[in-house]
């Protein structure tokens, strides 16, 4: 049979996406304006560069990282771009409504775009667990729900726990991972007989996934330092993230070889584990006092990532229906937790060192923040999963999971599969 969207989705997707885009344009028209204050060009350029780094991470880094499936690489890259574009628009509005709206219109600055890109990145991390099993109409729903949930989580944490921009955004790793895993848990799991080959990785897509990993590796220090207030914090964050990701690369490659009976290196392990250090130090990157500590954390994170990649896929595939190569979800869930634990340990050491009697209270606050992030991620993820199961979205049939031809026009192919 010819490989194209079912007729209903052809009607549903453009109508749904374009109506939503029109609604966003109207919201921007009525409720937003640009920051009109005097700003010197040099400051503007410096501020834009950080946002540019984040966009490269999102569009190229995460776009290509998820493109390792044999027959789903085009969709992975393009759907990521689609979600990023939509997510940034909605995140700018949402952040503005939540933080500025009582004062009238939402003022858009370069920082708004920076925050919005980071919020959209959350969706790109989560979606790794479901890519190939959902269509674009479903992904639109996922973007809207996840960006909304993350925006509200950040506002609640900011108001209750008085956290700064950096701290309440660094829950993104844990939030995105658990959101994605809970959505995956709700979707139809078993891959029908005869389609197992499609969720396997191929050489060229794996190379592009490695390219994605390289872009993420290069720009992770920008991500971890983007929301910090002072130059000294940014400097520490950049240095510590760099040391951590550098060590996690060495650990990932050598650990992958160690984990294989013939000492061979697994592409899948390496794609994900090279980023391990960046995720693990994220929360505390500006607070880590010396390079050796960041390097130790990179080492531990790399080992956890490789270990997770070796032993968790079986469980994830059985319980959540996540293919072996989509390891970002459980990887980030483990490493995000590690990062939060590291932050709490640093907090305890600092508090004891300062002779501060508030140790229990401080730790309780940190655990409260983390718990809230996980609970909201799981609840909103389950809600999204239930929404994605509704018949109106015309989800791809299980037999057409992980297949570009369901979504793309390939002129050189006369028929589908």
């Amino acid at each position: 049979m010819s490989s194209k969207y079912p007729r209903s989705v052809r009607r549903c997707l453009p109508l749904w996406a374009l109506t939503l885009e029109a609604a966003l344009i109207l919201l921007f028209y009525f409720f937003t304006h640009y920051d009109a204050s005097l700003e010197d060009q040099k400051g503007l350029v410096a501020s834009y560069q950080v946002g540019q780094d984040l966009t490269v991470m999102a569009a190229i880094g995460l776009g290509f990282l998820t493109s390792s499936f044999r027959r789903h690489s085009w969709s992975s890259v393009a759907f990521n771009l689609f979600m990023l574009a939509l997510g940034v628009q909605w995140a700018i509005l949402l952040d503005g409504f939540l933080s500025q709206f009582p004062s009238g219109k939402v003022v858009i600055t370069l920082f708004s775009i920076r925050l919005a890109t980071m919020s959209a990145l959350s969706v790109l991390i989560s979606v790794d667990a479901v890519l190939g099993k959902v269509n674009l109409a479903q992904l639109v729903v996922m973007v809207l729900v996840e960006v909304t949930a993350l925006g509200n989580l950040r506002m609640v944490i900011s108001n209750i726990f008085n956290t700064d921009y950096h701290m309440n955004m660094m829950h993104i790793y844990v939030f995105a991972a658990y959101f994605g895993l809970s959505v995956a848990w709700c979707l139809p799991k078993p891959l029908p007989e005869g389609t197992e080959d499609k969720d396997q990785t191929a050489t060229i897509p794996s190379l592009s996934a490695m390219l994605g990993a390289l872009f993420l590796w290069m720009f992770w220090p920008s991500f971890n330092s983007a929301l910090l207030r002072s130059p000294i914090e940014r400097k520490n964050a950049v240095f510590n993230t760099y040391y951590a990701v550098a060590v996690s690369v060495v650990t990932a490659i050598s650990g992958s070889s160690l984990a294989h009976p013939q000492g061979k290196i697994s592409k899948t392990y390496v794609h994900s584990a090279v980023l391990a250090g960046g995720v693990a130090v994220g929360t505390s990157c500006h607070l880590i006092p010396s390079p050796w500590l960041a390097m130790v954390l990179g080492l531990v994170a790399g080992l956890i990532s490789v270990g997770g990649a070796k032993y968790l896929p079986g469980c994830c595939n059985r319980v959540l229906g996540i293919p072996h190569s989509s390891i970002m979800g459980y990887n980030f869930s483990l490493l995000g937790l590690l990062g939060e634990i590291i932050y709490i340990v640093l907090l305890v050491l600092d508090t004891v060192g300062a002779g501060n009697g508030m140790i229990g209270f401080q730790v309780l606050l940190s655990i409260g923040e983390l718990s809230l992030a996980i609970v909201i991620a799981l609840m909103s993820g389950l809600l999204t999963g239930l929404l994605l199961n509704l018949k109106i979205w015309k989800a791809p049939h299980e037999a057409k999971y992980f297949d570009d031809q369901v979504f793309w026009k390939f002129p050189h192919l006369a028929v589908g599969f």
Partner: antibody, heavy 125, light 104 residues
């Protein structure tokens, strides 16, 4: 030597506008966040506004939000405070101050280590 | 909300003076102290609860954590008669209402 020098103060009518300047020397605004703090006659210090070192974030006290705008020109190494819709409550000595950070427990501690001499703004009809 | 006490005090040269600052919610150790003399700009004395700013005499010291903080001046000197302000930096900056130290 690190110094801050405010200017632009004066007498203005209610509802009027004024722009204060703060010229920095001995350091660059590109590597320092900056504050405006004011002190009404016979009263205590009141924080007004902050701009981050890279200019990406500007935050304001509730009492001035929507009326005051903090900005800077790094080529002139000068900080500004544009004040609109002024009322008698805005009568004060306005100080600019440098934002500094030091690692604390679970987050950084910020403080104002260098202050200008201040410029007086009087709102009166 | 930051509450400084007392709002004013009278002391003699050589006295030990203690000024307290209480916050409505925990601010960890993110508290700074400033000194201001009439007609002059404020001057930083202590940052992060207990760190002495360079050039400030060692008779000034700070302590506390959470919600209760103290500035202590051991052996008050003639040049120390001024108004002292606490300031928190845990959230949006805010100052205490000030404590005026006068000559007895």
């Amino acid at each position: 030597q690190v110094k801050l020098l405010e200017s632009g103060g004066g007498v203005v009518q209610p509802g009027g506008s004024l722009r204060l300047s703060c010229e920095a020397s001995g350091f660059t605004l590109r590597s320092s966040g900056m504050h405006w703090v004011r002190q009404a006659p016979g009263k205590g210090l009141e924080w007004v506004a902050l701009i981050w070192f890279d200019g990406s974030i500007r935050s304001y006290a509730e009492s001035v939000k929507g009326r005051f705008t903090i900005s800077r020109d790094t080529s002139k190494n000068t900080l500004y405070l544009q004040m609109r819709s002024l009322s008698a409550d805005d009568t004060a000595v306005y100080y600019c101050a440098r934002d500094k950070a030091v690692r604390g427990i679970s987050r950084y501690n910020y403080y104002m280590d260098v202050w200008g001499k201040g410029t007086t703004v009087t709102v009166s009809s | 909300v930051m509450t400084q006490s007392p709002s004013s005090l009278s002391a003699s040269v050589g006295d030990r003076v203690t000024i307290t600052c209480r916050t409505s919610q925990t601010i960890s150790r993110n508290l700074n102290w400033y000194q201001q003399k009439p007609g002059k700009a404020p001057k930083l004395l202590i940052y992060a609860t207990s760190s002495l700013q360079s050039g400030v005499p060692s008779r000034f010291s700070g302590s506390g954590s959470g919600t209760d903080f103290t500035l202590t001046i051991n052996s008050l000197q003639p040049e120390d008669f001024a108004t002292y302000y606490c300031q928190q930096s845990y959230t949006t900056p805010s100052f205490g209402q000030g404590t005026k130290v006068e000559i007895k």
